[in-house]
């Protein structure tokens, strides 16, 4: 019996077509993605073959404008469309709190949505009862499938899940809700959820029972043969796991924002057992046509997204340098403001020993694209922010050594002067360097912001010690030549959008004032 | 033709008796003031005496908890329930901004609210047209008596009046429409106002016309002979002027708070020119008994206070560091939230030229009475405020030269690691000390934020600039030994109460996480 | 949270009939498709009759076919079992199911069912 896995994950509402980078989409002949090109494929697969499933490993929510103004309600409404037959929760699920997923997604979505390691407690426990699932029996042909969902258990340090949802541990509840499945004579389970490419491949050997893994989080790119654009893949597809007792097990991811439409084909014998498995990410390009209903109705919600990106989301009294000649050179307030809000945007529920789980922010200068002019009567638009902001990256947690952030503060002024974007804007820290020593030797003094202490003060970086950090996704990947972050982090989780975070720090804030106060100073 | 005429200002929502230093009254015994005791004294000597004014001077709004939640409703209720017959605007009237006077106040009021040099512009002319008047004719047995109001042209710097509303010169404004009450042959004319001492006896010199000046904002205290309480008198009761065209004009005002009534006979001539004019402010102490059934309406009013003050503002994720072991030998959070606090609540318009017209705090350490501990589920009350600040004092503007505050940052260590109360936390200042050199010789540096920029940044103190600076009233009375504020400054103006700036601080942030940065260091 | 309540069940004689209800709330109704399960002392729970979400497909046991109906007021978010004919072996604990997904045809497996509600008693008496 053969079954066809159609999957997405990370898509973070990247709901229109982008450019190959997943950016904003400038030139329409060569866009890619989007969900009128996405349905274009799935009914093309649907016409062609018996038995597809539709499933999505989470991470829907956040990334552009139409999760900030549609707040959720796009996902469902655009998923429903596409038929989706399961869905993940991812944790970009909460970044809205427990309410902004119930409300616009829970109630609305005609699949099921499912997490078998996320339990609630207190008064909410009633409350989201029986709105998402720990799994779910889809009939599919003759057959039925079973779906276990499972989200990061790190969901509480990277969203805004509220103190009533706890996040067990995957692979522990996991197995008895697949082990119920089994005595349910559910005999072919996928395992679908969103807690990263290392988690995945333990739930695929942990896990008895589970005969595929569809993942995400991670970004994964697999592929099997030449790759059709950028993306390097980090394996084969599917990545075969050998499991505790002795199966092959597929395990597979498919990038993220929508680009690819994962495509996994399995044969199973009568008693479920996955005899082969085979395919491939399909690249979503403009070879493939955006289906005109769809496309019709992603213009008509589009309507909003124009009006909304010029209205006053709050005020600056005054200039928000965000000039190359400030940012690469000096501490500037944008650099400041920025990294303030990146801080605002990581305030979690901690242990008591805690004040917050991260007090840290770095920014490469040359990301500032646009200051800010204040003699508009101060009003701050979306707009003027993704001028500032115009890459569409994400504001990410990484965890680093302290010997790795020295290098990288080394990194921000090894070659000081001619205007290049690694100069690093900061929060939490205070940097001193002295430029007549030689590069690599720069930095005289690295105070960092402590995090296990009840009043925050600044103490000197610890080389062995481990750091969290926000920065934007494209430090964490080495970009601007931050190959010593790229290689020596030890963890990383991505983050929300970056104009999303400012916005809503300007918008919480009402009227900002930052100033240039002494985070980098040169001795 | 005798006139009495009775006058309070500055009032600040003293609508309970207080203690003698008009704080929260402890031991009731020996409390004073408060609308129900000054009732009592007013119908007394309205019975007593044919012609009797009751004219409030402004600055009834922001003092206390009353304020806080009636929000001037307070103030039109029980100035409405004591008859007075005219209040003039202050500056404080304006700190919920226009619609914050508009509704509760001068559509409540029962009586005349008076100002001749604000002028509406724009779309508020229309809507205010009317709801205050420049003057008012009042009649009194068979005569009549103008009233004209003037408002302190400092008030678009000292409180929220915004854009379109113009304060003129008083001198200028009022001019026109005394000769207006000439044409109109009143012929015994009051200006009652808000401008301060040294504004008043500059109207009763330059204009023509005025007769008495009925005054407020600089919480003068005037006496004749011994005076019976704490507060020395500037000057006499009344204090004499001589205009420009020779004629004695009484200028009065009567301390603060509700402490005292001010008690003026005047005598005029057939054609209204003042013969002789005598009193002396009339302290309302407990030998005055409280007026029962106002006191019964204040006590009725009072239970939505003691709701109010246990209700949660905002949330610390932060302990904040109010102890004396921190704040008297060190920079402190506590100190930083407040004075953070302190800026945030004196933003206003200014001009193009400055980002803000003040950049600066400074606060005693020994005014930081209590710590707030963050492990009672992060809330922050009133009630909890109350305890970091107990004695119900005001944030004030004042403007001091360079070298004044350098004598005061000396002074501010002069006895360093004594626990003594003059140590300074701070805003928009970077200090350090050198605690090896003498007293009077250890600031060895003192950075402040710019104002004059359109990027704050910190730059050095010079000795010959004037510099505006917001600080508690205790160190502007040159409270812990701060002399040489009292005895320097070139201007001061009393500003909003010191719980209120902070609570509402917090309200708007919603979670505060104020760290120890680098402020105040030693070297 | 998503709730099923059935009503509508009692004492019938043979060749009577009953109209069950059953009523959902918590999730969009047209987002459910809509089952009857029946469970008599000592046997298996057993499928009656279902209703896709769109009431336009529907699905009922050999036992039933002809006598059995199940409509669906989406206004109301109610579904209905109408039993006409009814017989002894008809006697059992009825179960009112959802599953939540949009499927043309509802399905006859008890394992696809999501939510369930707690029974209503049916017997037929000779």
């Known amino acids: 019996w053969e079954l066809t896995i159609l999957h997405t994950n990370d898509v973070h509402s990247r709901l229109e077509q982008t450019s190959e980078d997943s950016s904003k989409c400038v030139n329409a002949s060569r866009c890619m993605g989007g969900v009128a090109r996405l349905f274009t494929k799935v009914q093309q697969i649907r016409r062609a073959e018996p038995n597809v499933l539709l499933l999505d490993a989470g991470d829907q929510y956040q990334g552009t404008i139409w999760f900030t103004v549609y707040k959720g309600a796009e996902v469902a409404h655009f998923m429903n469309a596409l038929r989706y037959d399961a869905m993940a929760l991812g944790n970009h699920e909460f970044d809205n709190g427990v309410e902004g997923l119930i409300e616009p997604l829970l109630k609305e979505a005609k699949f099921p949505i499912l997490s078998a390691n996320i339990k609630a407690k207190g008064p909410l426990a009633s409350q989201i009862s029986g709105l998402y699932l720990p799994y779910k029996v889809l009939p599919v042909g003759d057959e039925v499938v079973g779906i276990v969902g499972y989200t990061s258990k790190e969901t509480p340090f990277l969203s805004n899940p509220g103190t009533n949802l706890v996040f067990e541990d995957e692979i522990t509840a996991l197995q008895p809700e697949v082990d119920k499945l089994k005595t349910l004579n559910v005999n072919k389970i996928i395992a679908l959820g969103h807690s990263g490419f290392e988690t995945d491949k333990l739930i695929a050997q942990k896990v008895r029972g589970v005969d595929v893994v569809v993942g995400g989080h991670s970004n994964t790119f697999l592929y099997t043969g030449n790759p059709p654009s950028k993306e390097v893949p980090a394996g084969k597809y599917p990545f075969i796991v050998t499991s505790d007792d002795g199966r092959k097990v597929p395990v597979v991811q498919a990038y993220a924002f929508g680009k690819y439409l994962g495509y996994l084909k399995i044969e199973f014998d009568e008693r479920g057992n996955v005899i082969s498995s085979h395919g491939n990410p399909i690249l979503l390009n403009s070879s493939i046509p955006e289906d005109p209903s769809i496309k019709a109705d992603i213009n008509k919600w589009r309507i909003k997204l124009d009006n909304y990106s010029t209205q006053e989301l709050g005020k600056t009294i005054v200039y928000l340098d965000g000039s190359s000649q400030s940012c690469r050179f000096r501490e500037c307030n944008m650099g400041n403001l920025i990294c303030d809000a990146m801080i605002n945007n990581n305030l979690r529920h901690a242990d008591e020993m805690f004040w917050n789980h991260v007090s840290m922010c770095i920014l490469n200068g040359g990301g500032i694209r646009s200051p800010i002019d204040e003699r508009n009567n101060g009003t701050i638009t979306w707009e003027n922010l993704a001028a500032v902001l115009p890459f569409g990256g994400t504001f990410d947690l990484v965890q680093l050594k302290g010997s790795t952030l020295k290098k990288a503060f080394e990194h921000s002024v090894h070659r000081y002067g001619q205007s290049t974007g690694e100069f690093l804007q900061v929060g939490g820290i205070h940097v001193v360097y002295d430029l007549s020593r030689k590069p690599g030797d720069r930095v005289v003094k690295l105070d960092v912001l402590c995090t296990k202490c009840r009043v925050p003060s600044y103490d000197p970086l610890k080389m062995d010690e481990i750091y969290k950090v926000i920065l934007p996704n494209f430090l964490a990947n080495g970009g601007d030549g931050f190959q010593m972050i790229k290689d020596e982090l030890l963890r990383h989780d991505s983050g929300d959008q970056d104009i999303n975070v400012v916005s809503t720090y300007i918008s919480k804030m009402k009227v900002i004032y930052p100033a240039v106060e002494g985070r980098i100073k040169f001795s | 033709w005798e006139l009495t005429i009775l006058h309070t200002n500055d009032v600040h929502s003293r609508l309970e008796q207080t203690s003698e230093d008009s704080s929260k009254c402890v031991n009731a015994s020996r409390c004073m003031g408060g609308v129900a005791r000054l009732f009592t004294k007013v119908q007394q000597i309205r019975r007593a005496e044919p012609n009797v004014l009751l004219l409030d001077a402004g600055d009834q709004y922001q003092g206390t908890i009353w304020f806080t939640v009636y929000k001037g409703a307070e103030v039109a209720h029980f100035m409405n329930a004591l008859r007075y017959d005219a209040m003039a605007l202050g500056n404080h009237e304006f700190d919920n901004g226009v619609e914050g006077l508009i509704e509760p106040l001068l559509k409540e009021a029962k009586f005349p609210i008076l100002s001749a040099n604000i002028k509406a512009k724009g779309p508020l002319a229309s809507q205010i047209s009317g709801l205050y008047l420049p003057y008012k004719v009042l009649p009194v047995g068979d005569e009549v008596v103008g009233i004209v109001g003037y408002t302190s042209k400092e008030t678009p710097f000292l409180s929220n009046p915004g854009t379109n509303l113009v304060f003129e010169d008083e001198i200028t404004a009022l001019q026109p429409e005394v000769d207006k009450l000439k044409t109109l042959n009143v012929n015994k004319i009051i200006a009652l106002g808000h401008s301060g001492f040294e504004t008043d006896k500059l109207i009763a010199q330059k204009v023509r016309g005025v007769d008495v000046v009925v005054g407020g904002h600089s919480n003068t205290f005037l006496y004749t002979g011994n005076p019976p309480s704490k507060e020395v008198p500037a000057g006499k009761y009344p204090f004499i002027v001589t205009s420009d065209d020779g004629r004695k004009v009484p200028v009065v005002q009567a301390y603060a708070f509700g402490k005292y009534l001010g008690y003026l006979k005047i005598e005029f001539d057939e054609r209204g020119n003042v013969i002789s004019s005598h009193g002396n402010p009339i302290l309302l102490n407990s030998s005055i008994p409280e007026d029962p059934s106002i006191k019964a309406d204040i006590n009725k009013w009072r239970i939505k206070l003691d709701n109010y003050s246990t209700q949660e503002l905002g949330k610390t994720i932060v302990y904040l560091d109010g102890s004396s072991q921190s704040c008297r030998f060190r920079e402190c959070n506590m100190g930083n939230l407040i004075c953070d606090a302190m800026i945030n609540n004196n933003l206003r318009h200014a001009d193009e030229m400055f980002w803000n017209h003040v950049s600066m705090c400074i606060l005693n350490g020994g005014g930081i009475r209590s710590p707030i501990d963050e492990r009672n589920n992060g809330t922050i009350t009133w009630e909890n405020l109350a305890a970091v600040l107990p004695f119900g004092g005001t944030f004030d503007l004042v403007q001091l030269k360079g070298s004044t505050l350098k004598k005061a940052f000396e002074h501010s260590v002069h006895r360093y690691g004594q626990s003594t109360g003059e140590f300074l936390q701070v805003g928009g200042i970077h200090v350090v000390y050198d605690l090896s050199r003498k007293p009077g010789d250890r600031v060895v540096k003192l950075d402040v934020l710019c104002t004059k920029c359109r990027v704050p940044s910190y730059d050095p103190l010079k000795m010959d600039e004037i510099y505006k600076v917001i600080l508690p009233n205790f160190l502007a009375n040159g409270g812990d030994g701060f002399q040489m504020i009292k005895d320097e400054l070139l201007r001061h103006d009393s500003g909003d109460q010191d719980i209120n700036v902070v609570s509402t601080y917090i309200s708007k942030m919603k979670v505060i996480y104020p760290a120890v940065e680098g402020r105040i260091k030693f070297s | 949270e998503v709730q099923l309540v059935e009503s509508g069940g009692g004492v019938v004689q043979t060749g009577g009939s009953l109209r069950l209800s059953c009523a959902a709330s918590?999730?969009?109704?047209?987002?459910?498709?809509m089952g009857w399960f029946r469970q008599a002392p000592g046997k298996e729970r057993e499928f009656v009759a279902a209703i896709s979400n769109s009431g336009a497909g529907t699905q009922f046991a050999d036992s039933v076919k002809g006598r059995f109906t199940i409509s669906r007021d989406n206004a109301k978010n109610t579904v209905y079992l109408q039993m006409n004919s009814l017989k002894p072996e008809d006697t059992a604990v009825y179960y009112c199911?959802?599953?939540?997904?949009?499927?043309?045809?509802?399905?006859?497996?008890?394992?696809?069912?999501?939510?369930w509600g707690r029974g209503t008693q049916v017997t037929v008496s000779s």
């Open positions: 918590g999730r969009t109704f047209t987002h459910l498709a």
């Open positions: 199911a959802a599953d939540w997904g949009t499927r043309d045809s509802p399905s006859k497996l008890n394992a696809v069912y999501d939510y």
